[in-house]
Amino acid sequence: CKAMHVAQPAVVLASSRGIASFVCEYASPGKATEVRVTVLRQADSQVTEVCAATYMMGNELTFLDDSICTGTSSGNQVNLTIQGLRAMDTGLYICKVELMYPPPYYLGIGNGTQIYVIDPEPCPDSDF
């Protein structure tokens, strides 16, 4: 397993509709054709997997059917969007990138993006 640098923004504020987007960029040492991206959430010293996708370079990211994440890739950048967020989902979202194929296997873990989500106060049919 070889290390790889992964960059992501320090802070992102989710929209009033509970949508947060950020870019995860990795410094690919070689010409990977298969990449796996995982988003982890760290809060209260607990780490949980939010979503994961494997993609072939040049193709769309494919998340599981029930995933709250969507994303697109462009070169060594992955644009990630997480939906349905509310205040209790505030936390540090860590981007983990694995270059699966061809060998050698590379692993990179970002420092995390602190996503802040605010619950709006009562108002006509606002998004919570």
Epitope: R17, G18, R41, T48, E49, V50, D65, D66, S67, I68, T70, I82, Q83, G84, L85, R86, A87, M88, D89, G91, D119, P120, E121, P122, D125, S126, D127, F128
Partner: antibody, heavy 123, light 107 residues
């Protein structure tokens, strides 16, 4: 085990207020949102509002904005739903239901419901 | 106002039949939709969340699909205990509106 236990049935006169409680146990109270949903006799489900027991913030369906108040007491793990200006069409069974943060591992929204509280509005 | 329209509003089917209920939402909600079964005199029971995830303890004859604005609940082989009213609900953000319900009866 997870339980949401609601207060007993109420009979109120038009114009009065009713306050229904929902006591949670078997999980961390402040880690889940709580919703209130009602169902009039022979009718469908109607979402009323949501409260964050951690901070106390809430949001209500538009039709209840001027009459609904949702509060919580973290010391007793209880949420309250108060509906004022009661009219006959408010006669319904009122339910509380919990809802985890979407990023909670294996968390399913509205997985546990209270047993329901029948509120009858009659003169 | 956000609307959820279920169809049909009622249906009658035989034991063993494949039954499909649809839910159309007036705006894109990604996959954030629940399905419930409510038997007469009982509280609603969560069947499916995030459009296709089967809730723990729910029989595998229930399945959900769809995303965006069009969703489907399927019962692969109808059982007598499935006599109930079925509801869809958006969980994308407030308001967490329910569909009007689909009443399912056994022929």
């Amino acid at each position: 085990q997870v339980q949401l236990v609601q207060s007993g049935a109420e009979v109120q006169k038009p114009g009065a207020s009713v306050k229904v409680s929902c006591k949670a146990s078997g999980y961390t109270f402040t880690s889940y949102y709580m919703h209130w949903v009602r169902q009039a006799p022979g009718q469908g489900l109607e979402w009323m509002g949501i409260i964050n027991p951690s901070g106390g913030s809430s949001n209500y369906a538009q039709k209840f904005l001027d009459r609904l108040t949702m509060t919580r007491d973290t010391s007793t793990s209880t949420v309250y739903m108060e509906l004022s200006g009661l009219r006959s069409e408010d006669t319904a069974v009122y339910y509380c239901a919990r809802d985890p943060p979407i990023t909670m591992f294996r968390g399913a929204p509205f997985d546990y419901w209270g047993q329901g509280t029948l509120v009858t509005v009659s003169s | 106002d956000i609307q959820l329209t279920q169809s049909p509003s009622s249906l009658s089917a035989s034991v063993g039949d494949r039954v499909t209920i649809t839910c159309r939402v007036s705006q894109d909600i990604s996959r954030l939709l629940n399905w419930y079964r409510q038997k007469p005199g009982e509280i609603p029971k969560l069947l499916i969340y995030r459009a296709s995830s089967l809730q723990s303890g729910v029989p595998s004859r229930f399945s959900g699909s769809g995303s965006g604005t069009d969703f489907t609940l399927t019962i692969s082989s109808l059982q007598p205990e499935d006599i109930a009213t079925y509801y869809c609900q958006r969980t994308y953000s407030a308001p967490y509106t329910f569909g009007q319900g689909t009443k399912l009866e056994i022929k």
